[in-house]
Interface confidence: low
């Protein structure tokens, strides 16, 4: 049977096949893919911008930052306000004070400890 390079197309992940000769072809890959048949998802994590211990997670032509609990935002640069998330973070009338990367309790009436429970 007659071999037609682009029928069926050997290009995957949405790549477009172009016949370059009687028995040769070229795949034009969609952004985010590479390889002779567009089989590889390009790693988008080198030189990533994830900060404050955020972990880069590769996607298709993009990446996401998986942030530790104290940080949020696209690049984990926005501080999570734990005082809003945990209204009862401080016990016994203590006042919650949000800080970069965490929070602290200002205790009253002789109470002490991280959450004013001692």
């Amino acid at each position: 049977s007659l071999y037609v390079p682009c029928a069926p197309s050997p290009c995957v992940n949405g790549g477009t096949c172009r016949q370059t000769g009687d028995f040769t072809f070229e795949c034009n890959c969609l952004p985010g893919f590479e390889g002779s048949t567009c089989e590889r998802n390009i790693d988008d994590c080198p030189n990533h911008r994830c900060q404050n211990g955020g972990v880069c997670v590769d996607g298709v032509n993009t990446y996401n930052c998986r942030c530790p609990p104290q940080w949020t935002g696209q690049f984990c640069t926005e501080d999570v306000d734990e005082c809003l998330l945990q209204p009862n973070a401080c016990q016994n009338g203590g006042t919650c004070a949000n800080r970069n990367g965490g929070y602290g309790c200002v205790c009253v009436n002789g109470w002490s400890g991280d959450d004013c429970s001692e």
Partner: antibody
């Protein structure tokens, strides 16, 4: 657009600070800003980059210690240079990358500022 | 680390011809490579990024290919306006690197 300023004629051993001013965008969008230089008749030489969302810096191995890149506002980046020698004579370009996944692909360049080190 | 070597240093090509410029990385950089065009008295202009993606407004006669350590910039149907110096640049790593850029290739038109 980008525009460099602060270049000129300086004596060997002197210090100089170059400023790159951005207009039409701000660094809060997550761009990296870099400095690249070019000696007369020579090729492009990378100096340093700064990740504007965090302040993290990257330097060419030869530039560490004598060059300092800083973000001084949401639209300005500086390059401080110390102990200048004739070998530092070059046009200094400021460049901006494409942001996020286009890290260090320099889509935008300033026209450059000439620094001449001579006695 | 990640030194970029460009060849040839200069090349002469006739109008309508094809020119091929090669760039070799000392270590694998995946597809993290850009090509720039620079004319005298001007800043560089981004032509191709991610090894093969054409930058906005760049004519289709410019083509980038390769991955790993071997990369090629091909200019087909060369025009007088293509006379310039071309640079490759790795964007894979900025740690312990002397220069992101290759040494450049000057393209002259016959």
């Amino acid at each position: 657009s980008l525009e460099e300023s602060g270049g000129g004629l300086v004596q060997p051993g002197a210090s100089l600070t170059l400023t790159c001013t951005a207009s039409g965008f701000s660094f809060s969008s997550g761009y990296d800003m870099c400095w690249v230089r070019q000696a007369p008749g020579k090729g492009l030489e990378w100096i340093a980059c700064i990740v504007t969302v965090s302040g993290n810096t990257y330097y060419a191995s030869w530039a560490k210690g004598r060059f300092t890149i800083s973000k001084t506002s949401s639209t300005t980046v500086t390059l401080q240079m110390t102990s200048l020698t004739a070998a530092d004579t070059a046009t200094y370009f400021c460049a901006r990358d494409g942001g996020f996944t286009d890290t260090w692909y320099f889509h935008l360049w300033g026209p450059g500022t000439l620094v001449t080190v001579s006695s | 680390a990640y030194d970029m070597t460009q060849t040839p240093a200069s090349v002469e090509v006739a109008v309508g011809g094809t020119v091929t410029i090669k760039c070799q990385a000392s270590e694998s950089i995946g597809s993290y490579l850009a090509w720039y065009q620079q004319k005298p008295g001007q800043p560089p202009k981004l032509l191709i990024y991610r090894a093969s993606t054409l930058a906005s407004g760049v004519p289709s006669r410019f083509k980038g290919s390769g991955s790993g350590t071997e990369f090629t910039l091909t200019i087909s149907g060369v025009q007088c306006d293509d006379a310039a110096t071309y640079y490759c640049q790795q964007t894979y790593s900025g740690a312990g690197v002397d220069n992101l850029f290759g040494g450049g290739t000057k393209v002259e038109i016959k």
